[in-house]
């Protein structure tokens, strides 16, 4: 059965936008004016996972690209990567766990917790132009809060 998806952009709580940095990495930086067109548009799919009033499992694909954010162990550390998939098979309702994030809404802000690695979150650095990564701490230096902007299909 088809999976429900919507198109959106994400900004961290410091209003940094997410853009491509090479073929398999995202970075966060402040954009304005026409540069806003550089920000990546996600296709957010609603998938199998733990669901409650404030927690919704999603997969984050890059719109019109066969790339998904995924969480894997690299050198024994949970790591965020962009993974290439077969577009014939994705998105699907029951995604592999490494692609699944628990979208958690708290005070009008969103967190994206890895389903594969609980308590690890999509994170950005305070510094400009740094990679988006998977962080194991909340409320510290690194930013784990985001806002979502809907993009028309």
């Amino acid at each position: 059965a088809p999976v429900r998806s919507l198109n959106c952009t994400l900004r961290d709580s410091q209003q940094k936008s997410l853009v491509m940095s090479g073929p398999y990495e995202l970075k966060a930086l402040h954009l304005q004016g026409q540069d806003m067109e550089q920000q990546v548009v996600f296709s957010m799919s609603f998938v199998q996972g733990e669901e409650s009033n404030d927690k919704i499992p999603v997969a984050l694909g890059l719109k019109e690209k066969n790339l998904y954010l995924s969480c894997v162990l690299k050198d024994d550390k949970p790591t965020l990567q962009l993974e290439s998939v077969d577009p014939k098979n994705y998105p699907k309702k029951k995604m592999e766990k490494r692609f699944v994030f628990n979208k958690i809404e708290i005070n009008n802000k969103l967190e994206f917790e890895s389903a594969q690695f609980p308590n690890w979150y999509i994170s950005t650095s305070q510094a400009e132009n740094m990679p988006v990564f998977l962080g194991g701490t909340k409320g510290g230096q690194d930013i784990t809060d985001f806002t979502m902007q809907f993009v028309s299909s």
């Epitope: 059965a1 088809p2 996972g49 733990e50 409650s52 029951k94 766990k97």
Partner: antibody, heavy 114, light 102 residues
Framework: QVQLQQWGAGLLKPSETLSLTCAVY????????WSWIRQPPGKGLEWIGE???????NYNPSLKSRVTISVDTSKNQFSLKLSSVTAADTAVYYC?????????????WGQGTL | QSVLTQPPSVSVSPGQTASITCSGD??????AFWYQQKPGQSPVLVIY???KRPSGIPERFSGSNSGNTATLTISGTQALDEADYYC?????????FGGGTK
């Protein structure tokens, strides 16, 4: 409380079509997936397929050529048809609900029909 | 077809811990679910999404899933836990049950 009540013809001759219906009482029909599972006597469970309220289906590849699952949202019912039955299709057939709150797995089951 | 493999039976004395395994290729990258079925009854969900318990299921039931193996653990087993247990996961677009463990 959700209840799934199922019925259909019990005894069939080889090559006939098995037809079962499951009625859903209580709870929203459109927010879930609806599945059929079977269990041959003394054996394990086999997933047959699922449908959502819009009529979109997934089937077990081993049965796909013989199975049709349909839905009637006006009656909160869904149905299973299995064509060209043989003795190997002898089983208890269960209908079940797949719920988002349990990770889209089967959390309510019917009583089973042999 | 995708296969989930369970031991046919697991035997423990009351009060001991029972562990039932379910193995399948890269099972840890999928969500695993466990059902309990008693004779003449419909299956009952006891663990979902690897390690979560539905309301009404006792705390002695727990689950884990990593690598190629999901495990259902029943600690402090009771006579009423005697049943068949089935693991359940998905493969591409369809669902798969393990063969069951008595």
């Amino acid at each position: 409380q959700v209840q799934l009540q199922q019925w259909g013809a019990g005894l069939l001759k080889p090559s006939e079509t098995l037809s079962l219906t499951c009625a859903v009482y209580g709870g929203s029909f459109s927010d879930y997936y609806w599945s059929w599972i079977r269990q041959p006597p003394g054996k394990g469970l086999e997933w047959i397929g699922e449908i959502d309220h819009s009529g979109s289906t997934n089937y077990n590849p081993s049965l796909k050529s013989r199975v049709t699952i349909s839905v009637d949202t006006s009656k909160n019912q869904f149905s299973l048809k299995l064509s060209s039955v043989t003795a190997a299709d002898t089983a208890v057939y269960y209908c079940a609900r797949a719920s988002p709150s349990s990770g889209w797995t089967l959390d309510y089951w019917g009583q089973g029909t042999l | 077809q995708s296969v989930l493999t369970q031991p046919p039976s697991v035997s423990v004395s009351p009060g001991q811990t029972a562990s039932i395994t379910c193995s399948g290729d890269k099972l840890g990258d999928k969500f695993a679910f466990w059902y309990q079925q008693k004779p003449g009854q419909s299956p009952v969900l006891v663990i979902y999404l690897d390690n979560k318990r539905p309301s009404g299921i006792p705390e002695r039931f727990s689950g884990s899933n990593s690598g190629n193996t999901a495990t259902l653990t029943i600690s402090g087993t009771q006579a009423l836990d005697e049943a068949d247990y089935y693991c359940y996961a998905w493969a591409d677009t369809y669902e798969v049950f393990g063969g069951g463990t008595k």
